[in-house]
Interface confidence: medium
């Protein structure tokens, strides 16, 4: 057993028919030593008396908050939460894998530039009783500080029959430098407590490996005289890392008929600028990627051709 | 990216264009080591991050873009001092700071160079002979640092008596090309940056 | 109350090879099932387990060349890719490795040879 | 993964002698920490689980002990059914892995 937060408690617990259970021992914070009785969530039944109740926690029923009272006043709560571990295996049910870009990828990281700014985000089926609560560092063994926000509802799918729903967290290295050359991972720890489970999932990684720049910004086309060409130009997203001519981008221009079967037409540069052949109903689109360090493209940025 | 690439100019500074060839080449090893030594920890995640020019350059703290040196987090340690006679230079844009960072890359190139080789030459005797370093990626080390031309003196390579144990050198050679595909990038911006100064 | 584990058998290197572990008068649905291998004169080495909802969990060797899976409530494969000599072992089924019941199967024999 | 060091790798005792085998994780793995005994032909048999938690039929003379990340089985009045391998089994949450394994022979 050991304290989550002030007054909540895990208990880990081998999840087998019949397995033995922890025996847990629960005292009342007070002063007080007689006249104290204990009951759990909602009940009036009385489970014991005395500073201290024994219970052996076994399943879900054995967990929930547990109240120590005295003459009819609330002295104290203990909330005890479950980490089911079958078979040496901690339970992942609260998320969903995501399967990219590998099995048991629970969370899932971007970051727009290298100022130490990244968003994590992940799924789940359940739409109560959920809480989520970030913690993130620089190495584990002398970890610097990362801040995170609180989780947040993000969005909403309906898959098939089942509705998912993705949370997200937005965290920020307290000391970054862009230039800097990683050589601690991030380390992200997630704790998630559905009804009274309890979870934990981390992930790691170097920022570098998670960037995924924004889409390139005023992407316009310029129709060249007396030819089918057009040049066409962009601009570096404005979330990008400065200087631009340190932290590169280089570009894919794509022209793709209205057609998902048409042959796409694919150039890339380093520059903000490309002249390509504008069919009658294509759009052209462009997209970026860090120019030394092959991470994620963006999305692609499009504009018809008409 | 196999694919049609428009690309530009190397322009006025000699140095981009090694420094483009260097990155290639490190990755296209990197890329190959990753492949032959499948059963190796030879990721990004299973290796332990090392880098030998720790304490001895400051690479990225004196090739730090100006726009940056308002950064506090950025400006660890900017006390060492090296040679200042690259010929990467165009002599009117000489300034103590990219005489001091070019001199730095020049510095990690040798040291990486020496490593490079003296691992070479355990993984030679390697009867597996399972992988060796690319000589192409050695070249391209070689001529980055001819168009650098400082003048240093010569580090002799180290030899070693004992027997080469080949799993740790094959582990050793996939940490130090990760470390030098990291460092191959920052030479590559700090390029990108000096040409377009 | 036993498992019985079956399919082993020689095998040429490259090869690839199925095992099932089935289970008679007990039940798999509330346990965990996990694999075990051991080579001859060798020790033990915990492969990789496949809990009650079906979530997988592998070694960090085996992962990639070693597929375990549940087709039945009584039935737990192990399908091999890639065979070498060095998978030559007798493969282990058992039930719930750390809890008291824990029932083993009398392991099944593979031998990876040219 | 975590990672079971096993100590000695053999050792043998007279009948009525006390054996202690070592086991050390390579992280903290609390109480996940299963003791098998090994007998040539046959299938490893639990002895001890959660660390300390004696199974069913095992006889009291076997004891599982834990400090920090060091796990030790204790075996007093060492008796002749008792020659065999011995493994501990060390589970991190996400992987187990087994000790080397110790043989155990009788004089």
């Known amino acids: 057993i050991w304290e989550l937060k002030k007054d909540v408690y895990v208990v880990e617990l081998d999840w087998y028919p019949d397995a033995p259970g922890e025996m847990v021992v629960l005292t009342c914070d007070t002063p007080e030593e007689d006249g104290i009785t204990w009951t759990l969530d909602q009940s009036s039944e009385v489970l014991g008396s005395g500073k201290t109740l024994t219970i052996q926690v076994k399943e879900f029923g054995d967990a929930g908050q547990y109240t120590c009272h005295k003459g009819g006043e609330v002295l104290s709560h203990s909330l005890l939460l479950l980490h089911k571990k079958e078979d040496g295996i901690w339970s992942t049910d609260i998320l969903k894998d995501q399967k990219e870009p590998k099995n048991k990828t629970f969370l899932r990281c971007e970051a727009k530039n290298y100022s130490g700014r990244f968003t994590c985000w992940w799924l789940t089926t359940i739409s109560t009783d959920l809480t989520f609560s970030v913690k993130s560092s620089r190495g584990s063994s002398d970890p610097q500080g990362v801040t995170c926000g609180a989780a947040t509802l993000s969005a909403e799918r309906v898959r098939g029959d089942n509705k998912e729903y993705e949370y997200s967290v937005e965290c920020q290295e307290d000391s970054a430098c862009p230039a800097a050359e990683e050589s601690l991972p991030i380390e992200v720890m997630v704790d998630a407590v559905h009804k009274l489970k309890y979870e934990n999932y981390t992930s790691s990684f170097f920022i570098r490996d998670i960037i995924k720049p924004d889409p390139p910004k005023n992407l316009q086309l310029k129709p060249l005289k007396n030819s089918r060409q057009v040049e066409v130009s962009w601009e570096y997203p404005d979330t990008w890392s400065t200087p631009h001519s340190y932290f590169s981008l280089t570009f894919c221009v794509q022209v793709q008929g209205k057609s998902k079967r048409e042959k796409k037409d694919r150039v890339f540069t380093d520059k903000t600028s490309a002249t390509v052949i504008c069919r009658k109903n294509a759009s052209i689109s462009v997209r970026a990627q860090d120019r030394y360090y092959s991470s994620s493209w963006s999305e692609w940025a499009s504009v018809p051709c008409s | 990216r196999n694919l049609p690439v428009a690309t530009p100019d190397p322009g006025m500074f000699p140095c981009l264009h090694h420094s483009q060839n260097l990155l290639r080449a490190v990755s296209n090893m990197l890329q190959k080591a990753r492949q032959t030594l499948e059963f190796y920890p030879c990721t990004s995640e299973e290796i332990d991050h090392e880098d030998i020019t720790k304490d001895k350059t400051s690479t990225v703290e004196a090739c730090l873009p100006l726009e940056l040196t308002k950064n506090e987090s950025c400006l660890n340690s900017r006390e060492t001092s090296f040679i200042t006679n690259g010929s990467c230079l165009a002599s009117r844009k000489t300034s103590f700071m990219m005489a001091l960072c070019l001199s730095s890359i020049y510095e990690d190139l040798k040291m990486y160079q020496v490593e490079f080789k003296t691992m070479n030459a355990k993984l030679l005797m390697d009867p597996k002979r399972q992988i060796f370093l690319d000589q192409n990626m050695l070249a391209v080390i070689d001529e980055l640092m001819q168009a650098l031309n400082f003048n240093s003196e010569t580090v002799p390579q180290k030899s070693s008596l004992e027997e080469p144990d080949f799993y740790k050198t094959k582990i050793k050679l996939c940490i130090l090309l990760h470390a030098f595909r990291i460092r191959a990038v920052t030479i590559d911006r700090v390029m990108s940056y000096l040409n377009a100064s | 109350q036993e498992l019985k584990e079956s399919g082993g058998r020689l095998v040429t290197p490259g090869g690839s090879l199925t095992l099932s572990c089935t289970a008679s008068?007990?039940?798999?649905?509330?346990?965990?099932m996990t694999w075990v291998r051991q080579a001859p004169g060798k020790g033990l080495e915990w492969m990789g387990v496949?809990?009650?909802?079906?979530?997988l969990n592998y070694a960090s060797w085996a992962q990639g060349r070693f597929t375990i899976s549940k087709p039945s409530s009584t039935t737990v494969d192990l399908k091999m890719t890639s065979l070498t000599t060095e998978d030559t072992a007798t493969y282990f089924c058992?039930?719930?490795?750390?809890?008291?019941?824990?029932?083993w199967g009398p392991g099944t024999l593979v031998t990876v040879s040219s | 993964d975590v990672v079971m060091t096993q100590t000695p790798s053999s050792t043998s005792a007279a009948v009525g002698g006390t054996v202690t085998i070592k086991c050390q994780a390579s992280?903290?793995?609390?109480?996940?920490l299963a003791w098998y005994q090994q007998k040539p032909g046959q299938p490893p048999k639990p002895l001890i689980v959660?660390?300390?938690i004696l199974t069913s039929g095992v006889p009291s003379r076997f004891k599982g002990s834990r400090s920090g990340t060091e796990y030790t089985l204790t075996i007093s009045g060492v008796q002749r059914e008792d020659a065999a391998t011995y493994y501990c089994?060390?589970?991190?949450?996400?992987?187990?892995?087994f000790g080397g394994g110790t043989e155990l022979e009788i004089l």
């Open positions: 496949i809990g009650v909802g079906g979530t």
């Open positions: 008068g007990l039940t798999l649905g509330s346990y965990s």
């Open positions: 089994l060390g589970g991190d949450g996400h992987v187990s892995n």
């Open positions: 058992a039930r719930g490795t750390y809890s008291g019941d824990s029932i």
């Open positions: 959660r660390a300390s």
């Open positions: 992280q903290s793995i609390s109480s996940w």
